[in-house]
Interface confidence: medium
């Protein structure tokens, strides 16, 4: 190889870890970029090397694996911090190479501080619970691989700042937190603190996630089109602006793609020559049911446009529906002088 295959800075893997806590970071090369795993690479004689660039610097540095108490170490394809320090923040690179092959990727690592109530700049994962759906559990995330199965850690759960003890419908069960019946009042941030011993030292892992109580699949219905409907007629004269809202209600459905679209004479607006604009707005209820409104607009409608068929369509995982708007041309008011003349039989 005449050069190193450089996958650049993988900003999709913006890793955030808490200060003064252990962190284990897998080299992304084997997870996202190469078709073989670390064991295969190692047995083929390839060496995995780590280095980093400090925050606000552009000079690469080796990682010091000989710090007191082995604070930073490497084990197979994992970079370990026991524990992290604030100034470990930077871009880390793992490079796989031998004398003839080289491949590397960098990723950002941010060491963040938290306050006593676990507030921090950390981006929190969201766990959705169905409202009034029976027992549901959340699990303390990203703690695998930190300690062997022979080690029995202690786990403490918090809601916001408060330790979860004697809560009505929330019960800590080791790594799991059980919700007997999820209600809107259970919305919030939940933190597990895992404490475990290692080589005479005690380490803490703090993991916070956001719980969002959402609509239950038991109550889910196909999309409901509120507008257009049979009660509203869009009556316009040529030259006026035609505005037709399509308003659709979607029940919350996990991982469902909610879609709303218009057809004009059976075609998508992009596929026809008339000057149409579509504006969309979305709103959500407390349980994440969704209302989408798409307003179809023709600035200066023609008599031809008023003869067309305008249909609003909606689709979710629960089904597909459609509704035509009632559009007609306004009959012009009679011209008064002509009517009078005719009425009196003028010749």
């Amino acid at each position: 190889s005449e050069r190193c295959d450089d996958w650049g800075l993988d900003t999709m893997r913006q890793i955030q870890v808490f200060e003064d806590e252990p962190a284990r970071i897998k080299c992304p090369l084997f997870e996202h970029f190469l078709k073989f795993n670390y064991s295969t690479a190692h047995s083929a004689g390839l060496t995995l090397i780590w280095y980093w660039t400090r925050q606000d610097r552009d000079l690469e540095e080796p990682i010091n694996f000989r710090l007191p108490e082995n604070r930073i170490s490497k084990e197979k394809d994992v970079l370990w911090f026991r524990p992290t320090l604030l100034n470990d923040t930077g871009n880390y690179t793992c490079m796989l190479r031998n004398t003839t092959y080289c491949s590397k990727v960098a990723f950002p690592l941010e060491v963040v501080q938290k306050d006593s109530c676990f507030n921090s700049p950390m981006k929190l994962p969201v766990h959705k619970l169905y409202i009034e759906y029976g027992i549901q559990r959340i699990t303390c995330p990203n703690v695998d691989g930190y300690f062997p199965s022979s080690v029995k850690p202690t786990i403490t759960w918090y809601m916001g700042c408060y330790k979860i003890q004697n809560f009505n419908n929330v019960i800590p069960e080791g790594m799991n937190l059980s919700f007997l019946i999820a209600l809107i009042s259970n919305n919030g941030n939940y933190t597990c603190v895992v404490t475990y011993p290692e080589n005479g030292r005690t380490f803490h892992l703090t993991r916070t996630l956001t719980v969002k109580v959402v609509g239950s699949p038991k109550n889910a219905v196909p999309p409901v089109i509120h507008s257009p409907n049979d009660h509203v007629v869009y009556e316009k004269e040529p030259g006026e602006e035609l505005l037709i809202p399509c308003t659709v209600y979607f029940s919350f459905l996990m991982d469902s793609r909610n879609e709303v679209w218009w057809t004009i004479d059976g075609k998508k607006p992009d596929d026809i020559t008339i000057d149409v604009t579509i504006n969309e707005s979305i709103s959500h209820s407390r349980t994440e049911d969704e209302t989408r409104t798409q307003i179809l607009s023709i600035k200066k409608v023609t008599s031809e446009d008023l003869k067309r068929s305008y249909v609003c369509h909606a689709r979710s995982a629960k089904g597909e529906v459609a509704k035509a708007a009632k559009v007609k041309q306004k009959v012009p008011a009679p011209r008064y002088t002509v009517e009078l003349a005719c009425g009196f039989g003028a010749t």
């Epitope: 090397i49 610097r57 690469e60 540095e61 080796p62 010091n64 000989r66 004398t99 003839t100």
Partner: antibody
Framework: SLEESGGRLVTPGTPLTLTCTVS????????MGWVRQAPGEGLEWIGS??????TYYATWAKGRFTISKTSSTTLDLKITSPTTEDTATYFC?????????????????WGQGTLVTVS | DIVMTQTPASVSEPVGGTVTIRCQAS??????LSWYQQKPGQPPKLLIY???ALASGVSSRFIGSGYGTEFTLTISGVQSEDAATYYC???????????????FGGGTEVVVK
């Protein structure tokens, strides 16, 4: 492997270029350096070049030596104006201490050296 | 620039004995220190890197230790083939283009009786 060449007897002030030819690996992947050893004396680092081409020199060597890569397998050390104090065996070294060689934290591959005599 | 002071300049030890070589940096170099062995007419050979990591194929009789400014190379159960000159080498100014450099200690000659 590394093989140095170009060492010979030169008169003071006559520029001299030493060449290091590498085999089994590419200079685009590894950092390289030059270390010298005067007869009966210790080791002295002259400078290094990263895989990306950045050069670093010992304070005393700046302006007196130039390190460059002439291909993916050859590395040059130019002694711009040799003096009698530059009489030494010159070793070409490979840095494995740090990935793309910007910092030579250690040298684990050495050439046999080439002798330069300035007289 | 950082100066590496290596002591002693020469040491003599019978086979089976223990040799201790010290290297002192004029300022902290964290653990960016290596040890080399050089026999007459040969290039140096890497023994230890990052202060205490044993290079590939090197006998475990060689032990490196230290951090900051004080470093030690210990050769336990000295063998006749250990007769050589030993050098420490540091890397300093890591993370800085302008201050970056490499320095060697003056060397320690080990004679095995």
């Amino acid at each position: 492997s590394l093989e140095e060449s170009g060492g010979r007897l030169v008169t003071p002030g006559t520029p001299l270029t030493l060449t290091c030819t590498v085999s089994g690996f590419s200079l685009s992947i590894y950092g390289m350096g030059w270390v010298r050893q005067a007869p009966g004396e210790g080791l002295e680092w002259i400078g290094s070049i990263s895989s990306g081409g950045s050069t670093y020199y010992a304070t005393w060597a700046k302006g007196r030596f130039t390190i460059s890569k002439t291909s993916s397998t050859t590395l040059d050390l130019k002694i711009t104006s040799p003096t009698t104090e530059d009489t030494a065996t010159y070793f070409c070294v490979r840095s494995d201490g740090y990935t793309n060689g910007d910092y030579d934290t250690y040298f684990n591959l050495w050439g046999q050296g080439t002798l330069v005599t300035v007289s | 620039d950082i100066v590496m002071t290596q002591t002693p300049a020469s040491v003599s030890e019978p086979v089976g004995g223990t040799v201790t070589i010290r290297c002192q940096a004029s300022q902290s170099i964290s653990s960016w220190l290596s040890w080399y062995q050089q026999k007459p007419g040969q290039p140096p050979k890497l023994l230890i890197y990052q202060a205490s990591a044993l290079a590939s194929g090197v006998s475990s009789r060689f032990i490196g230790s230290g951090y900051g400014t004080e470093f030690t190379l210990t050769i336990s159960g000295v063998q006749s083939e250990d007769a050589a000159t030993y050098y420490c080498q540091c890397t300093y100014g890591i993370g800085s283009n302008s201050d970056y450099g490499v320095a060697f200690g003056g060397g320690t000659e080990v004679v095995v009786k």
